[in-house]
């Protein structure tokens, strides 16, 4: 039959080449002369010329050694034609299977593999996996089947078999207890991969196993007792630096210290933080200490780590005796800010209030007083008694010095300590209004037509507070009422000025008297420009210029 069974050819053949493999034969050769040819990759297409055929005998030829790792199987087609070139057979499939030889060593995927495992782990814990590949066949032969082994371990502490490797997966695991980072932080394993499932060619690589830190060492105070001196009242003052040692990995959570004040700080006066570089405990004052109240504090501080301990460990405690040093403290005004109500315009020499300070120190120190800031210069203060009196006219309506009816003064108290210290207080005078301002119209200049004049509405303002303001009353004086009328509106905050008789074009004075609810009267002269015009006007028309 025109059929060829798959042909097996071993790779790396020694020849001689061309080498006869198999003979193509068509039974049509009894009737006519047959010529054979082959096509396909390896014959007439890349890789061209690996195989050829003798055209008349049909011998299939191999022209060169084969490499299974490059091409494991060739699929060719055999053709048979007669002398006239006519095809006498259907194209026949020729399968050439390249059989494997163990011509490739295993290759590790990396020269150096890196893995890590926590110190103190139990035997059986997986560390890492190494991988080697072998290009040879691992399905039909053992040529490409890799077996892993550990050749050596450095260092050999605590003994030389700390790890094992799974012969087929390459998984490295811990086989013995006793991994201690503080003694051996890193192991170097020389690993082997051997093909033929362990009986063939060997290649080596390195596996570096880093032993990771576990918190198996407690931080210890060194020293455990401290004495410190702190001036009273100092806030954020560094009292003492506490030093610890920890055998775990520096700058790791297992090494970084966490400090806790266990006792002796009933008033919550102290705080302790960890210095980020030195790992020291920095004890500072959270509040000022009071020598007069307590001149010595004994603190008990415990140290642990950021990370929890992996096993039960004793914690280290330090004792710190803090001596509070006496400081001359400043007098303190009571209250620090004093609000006093006082009527504006009180007579000079009239007392305003007494404002005094207390000295926290135990000795009876003499305190003297003075005014530190009095923007308008309205007040004086007795240096011995702290009596504040008026020396100027307190004016509630003085917008330069008074804000929202309040006049602010700063006073100073000084003790006779060595050196002397000072304290300040704030005196807030709430000025009570008196009816010291009459109503004033706005604007005080008007322009009006002498024919069909428009009523002029003037706003009334009064610097005083209610009830010393509206309702207002208006009255024209000095014969102004002959030509003009003045009426206050219903709301009582505007006055309407009207021209009631014809006046020739000119400028006139209108005498307007306004009084407030407390009958405080104010006379204002309104300058009225009368124009020859009808109705509404802003400036007089025509060539006339007012005088």
């Amino acid at each position: 039959d025109w059929v060829v069974a798959p042909i097996s050819v071993p790779e790396n053949g020694k020849g001689p080449f061309p080498q006869r493999l198999n003979q193509l034969k068509s039974n049509k050769d009894r009737d006519t002369k047959i010529f054979y040819s082959i096509t396909g990759p390896g014959a007439d297409s890349p890789p061209e010329g690996v195989f050829a055929v003798e055209k008349e005998t049909g011998w299939l030829l191999l022209n060169k050694p084969l490499d299974r790792e490059e091409i494991a199987k060739y699929e060719l087609y055999g053709h048979a034609v007669s002398e006239n070139g006519a095809s006498v057979e259907e194209p026949m499939n020729i399968s050439i299977i390249v059989t494997d030889q163990n011509d490739n060593k295993p290759k590790f995927t990396q020269d150096t593999f890196r893995g890590s495992v926590l110190e103190g782990v139990l035997p059986g814990t997986s560390v890492m996996q190494v991988t080697a590949t072998d290009e040879d066949d691992a399905i039909y032969t053992y040529n490409g089947v890799v077996a892993y082994s550990i050749h050596s371990q450095e260092p050999k502490d605590p003994h030389d078999l700390m790890f094992t490797i799974h012969r087929s997966t390459g998984t490295i695991s811990v086989i013995s207890s006793g991994l201690d980072r503080e003694k051996v932080p890193e192991y170097t394993l020389t690993i082997q991969a051997t093909d033929m499932d362990g009986d063939g060619s060997t290649t080596t690589a390195v596996a570096v196993v880093e032993i990771l830190d576990a918190n198996d060492n407690a931080p210890m105070f060194d020293p455990q007792k401290y004495e410190a001196h702190v001036p009273e009242n100092a806030v954020g003052h560094e009292v003492q630096r506490l030093t610890v040692t920890d055998l775990d990995a520096p700058n790791s959570p297992a090494w970084r210290a966490t400090y806790l004040i266990m006792g002796g700080d009933d008033g919550d006066h102290f705080t302790i933080t960890t210095h980020p570089e030195s790992n020291q405990g920095i004890l500072t004052t959270r509040k000022g200490l009071d020598f007069e109240a307590k001149n010595q504090h004994t603190l008990y501080v415990e140290v642990t780590n950021e990370a929890p301990f992996v096993l039960k460990l004793p914690t280290s405690t330090a004792t710190i005796v803090v001596h509070v040093e006496d400081v001359n403290e400043a007098p303190v005004f009571v209250p620090p800010s004093k609000v006093v109500e006082v009527q504006e315009g009180i007579p000079t020499g009239e007392p305003v209030c007494v404002y005094t300070a207390e000295d926290p120190d135990k000795e009876n120190q003499k305190i003297s007083y003075r005014i530190l800031r009095d923007p308008a210069g309205w007040l004086a203060m007795d240096p011995d008694s702290g009596q504040v009196t008026a020396v100027g006219t307190l004016d509630r309506e003085d917008e330069q010095f008074v804000r929202n009816n309040i006049y602010e003064v700063m006073v100073l108290a000084m003790d006779n300590g060595s050196p002397p210290t000072t304290g300040t207080g704030t005196l807030l005078l709430t000025l009570i209004d008196v009816n010291d301002h009459g109503p004033v119209p706005e604007p005080r200049q008007i322009t009006i037509c002498n024919q069909s004049p428009v009523r002029q509405v003037l706003n009334i303002t009064d610097k005083d507070l209610s009830p010393h303001t509206s309702p207002f009353q208006a009255q024209l004086t000095d014969d102004s009422d002959i030509y003009w009328t003045a009426e206050v509106n219903e709301e009582g905050d505007t006055v309407v000025l009207s021209l009631k008789k014809f006046l020739k074009q000119d400028t006139y004075d209108v005498h307007l008297s306004l009084s407030d609810h407390g009958n405080k009267e104010q006379l204002t002269v309104i300058r009225a420009t009368v124009c020859d015009c009808h109705g509404h006007v802003e400036t007089c028309p025509g060539p006339w210029k007012g005088g």
């Epitope: 061309p18 050829a52 055209k55 030829l61 022209n63 060169k64 070139g85």
Partner: antibody, heavy 121, light 107 residues
């Protein structure tokens, strides 16, 4: 074994065609490959292509596809090469050379004496 | 296509001397290399095929060697009739390619 290129020197005009013959004797003409090789004056050898007279199978150097056409007549044991659309670049000596069929991997063991083709207007 | 690089391009030698010509293939051609000799105005003659097999009637002073990509032709005790141009040729895959030639002249 003898290969005789019967056509003498050819002088042809640009654009024309020429057909060179090569008569074989002393071996089984049908069962060996016939190669054709070009040599320009003072230059090296350049393979054009080959034909297997038994079934007429041909193989060309890509450079000469469309330029050269190879045929064979088994009855007269003669191989032919036709060159078309001639230019001055085609002026050369053309050899025929036999190659035995052993997977086509034998060298060219017998050569014709060569036919000179000159293309000139 | 395969490129065949031949060296030297030319050389002068005296009768009785030994000369070596080399040929390099741009890719592996195993042992499929032939050497030809061509005299002025004549057709090439096969000397060696399959890198080291002498063709019929070729004197034994000629010898070929090499495989893969590096080949050489050695002529011991040069004779007057050995002068001419020598070509190497790949006879592995088509297109069959030739070296540029080495012209051997009498000194």
């Amino acid at each position: 074994v003898q290969l005789v290129e019967e056509s003498g020197p050819e002088l042809v005009k640009p654009g024309a065609s020429v057909k060179i013959s090569c008569k074989a004797s002393g071996y089984a003409f049908s069962s060996s490959w016939m190669n054709w090789v070009k040599q320009r004056p003072g230059k090296g050898l350049e393979w054009i292509g080959r034909i297997y007279p038994g079934d007429g199978e041909t193989k060309y150097n890509g450079k000469f596809k469309g330029k050269a056409t190879l045929t064979a007549d088994k009855s007269s044991s003669t191989a032919y090469m036709q060159l078309s659309s001639l230019t001055s670049e085609d002026s050369a000596v053309y050899f025929c050379a036999r190659q035995r069929d052993y997977g086509a991997l034998y060298a060219m063991d017998y050569w014709g004496q060569g036919t000179s083709v000159t293309v000139s207007s | 296509e395969l490129v065949m690089t031949q060296s030297p391009a030319s050389l002068s030698a005296s009768v009785g001397e030994t000369v070596t010509i080399t040929c390099r293939a741009s890719d592996d051609i195993y042992s499929y290399l032939a050497w030809y000799q061509q005299k002025q105005g004549k057709s090439p003659q096969l000397l060696v095929y399959n890198a080291k097999t002498l063709a019929e009637g070729v004197p034994s002073r000629f010898s070929g060697s090499g495989s893969g990509t590096q080949f050489s032709l050695k002529i011991n005790s040069l004779q007057p009739e050995d002068f001419g141009t020598y070509y190497c040729q790949n006879h592995y895959v088509t297109p069959f390619t030739f070296g540029a030639g080495t012209k051997l002249e009498i000194k």
